[in-house]
């Protein structure tokens, strides 16, 4: 892939191995775990990143209340099945034949079942709410400066089109970033909001996926923005299907 440099590395994904054996003898970078060639000029899909991770040696300034249908990724890491395009397969199963349905960001959206469980389609996550709490600072950040810096970050670092950053909310010390992207809005070549959110999450945790870049150094007017807690809520185009047992737990 052309973005893989002459020295044959992948700037956008350190969880790859690159060698000069691609078409035309060009550099080709394969994701660890799956072996699929990745496009190093853009973000790698979350599914391939999770698979690589599992294989590695190891407008109103009010806060948004997540919808009753919002999902949080409580299940943690798993080794996912990815489709030929590197997206999550709608049905995921573990080694013991326990299966469940996931959304486009790989978060479980049904109760767990057995191999007979059917997941007819991959349901798109069209709204992501990233809820951050920053460490104490001398004073509150200026909201418009914070808004501009976070929008710049998603545009420049994650290559996410600005139209998909719907809003940035701030009530010290809580920051909320809303990403919205309907199926109809996403054009070929557009970064997926789920992939951008995953890269951001890993950056915030100090586990950058970018090759050779320093970690994320977020500053607002020169003042460091240090995050001490992150919660991410995922809203799907079709509400999830959990039993009442789970909902009342």
């Amino acid at each position: 892939h052309t973005a893989a440099q002459d020295n044959c590395t992948c700037p956008t994904n350190k969880m790859t191995v690159c060698s000069p054996d691609g078409p035309g003898g060009r550099c080709q970078c394969r994701a660890l775990g799956s072996g699929m060639a990745v496009d190093c000029s853009t973000l790698t899909s979350k599914c391939l990143l999770l698979k690589a991770r599992m294989s590695a040696p190891k407008n109103a300034r009010t806060l948004v209340r997540p919808s009753e249908h919002a999902l949080v990724d409580n299940d943690g890491l798993y080794d996912p099945d990815c489709d030929p395009e590197g997206r999550f397969k709608a049905r995921q199963c573990n080694q013991t034949s326990v299966c469940w349905c996931v959304n486009s960001v790989g978060v479980r959206r049904t109760d767990k079942g057995d191999l007979s469980l059917r997941c007819d389609e991959l349901v798109r996550t069209h709204h992501i709410l990233i809820d951050l709490r920053h460490r104490p600072t001398a004073g509150a950040f200026n909201h418009s400066d914070l808004d501009a810096e976070l929008r710049r970050l998603f545009r420049e670092r994650y290559r996410l089109h600005p139209k998909f950053v719907a809003a940035v909310h701030y009530e010290q010390p809580t920051i909320q970033i809303e990403l919205r992207q309907n199926t109809s809005q996403k054009a070929a070549g557009d970064v997926d909001i789920g992939d951008a959110a995953y890269y951001f999450e890993r950056d915030i945790k100090g586990e950058s996926l970018f090759q050779g870049r320093g970690g994320l150094d977020l500053r607002v007017r020169g003042e460091p923005l240090q995050v001490e807690r992150t919660l991410i809520y995922y809203l799907d185009e079709i509400p999830p299907k959990f039993s009442m047992k789970r909902l009342t737990a």
């Epitope: 191995v17 060698s19 000069p20 054996d21 078409p23 080709q28 660890l32 799956s34 072996g35 030929p84």
Partner: antibody, heavy 115, light 107 residues
Framework: QVQLQQSGAELVRPGTSVKISCKAS????????LGWVKQRPGHGLEWIGN????????NYNEKFKGKAILTADTSSSTAYMQLSSLTSEDSGVYFC????????WGQGTTLTVSS | DILLTQSPAILSVSPGERVSFSCRAS??????IHWYQQRTNGFPRLLIK???ESISGIPSRFSGSGSGTDFTLSINSVESEDIADYYC?????????FGSGTKLEIK
Amino acid sequence: QVQLQQSGAELVRPGTSVKISCKASGYTFTNYWLGWVKQRPGHGLEWIGNIFPGGGYTNYNEKFKGKAILTADTSSSTAYMQLSSLTSEDSGVYFCAREGVMDYWGQGTTLTVSS
Amino acid sequence: DILLTQSPAILSVSPGERVSFSCRASQNIGTSIHWYQQRTNGFPRLLIKYASESISGIPSRFSGSGSGTDFTLSINSVESEDIADYYCQQSYSWPFTFGSGTKLEIK
């Protein structure tokens, strides 16, 4: 020119282990994947797994997990495949090849497992 | 795992004829297919890479085409030295897989 030179034929007893070598020359050993392929008489080609000597990364065909262990010594540009708990089913010819396009192949190592 | 299906199992042709080998993948693999020739008691030799890219030192009578799931290797004028087994292999994702092969015989 690129060459892959494999170790000689092996005749071993069932239940034992064997280690086959593949010495690379003519290219930068640490820059390419090195794969291993099995062929039984009258059968087709079966991919066993591969190793990236530059980082020690390995991948295995599920069928050969627990059977084959791939290693590489970058100082001598040599890849190794150890096969353990050998049975007659493991008899065949084993090839090493530079990947992902298998553009250069070793001459093959014939393994015979017999009591 | 990606399954590669080669057909037919055996091809019998006369010298000078054009011959085509088919390889079908169980999913879309773009152009990540490669073709090999293996003569009796020899090691496989790369003929075509990435579906249609020619290889230095391989006679120009060998060509490849296809993308997605259907691929073809062609020999435009078969010679007696082409008697061999022909295999396709995918490098789209691990585990890499080979087709079951097609044996070329000369009438």
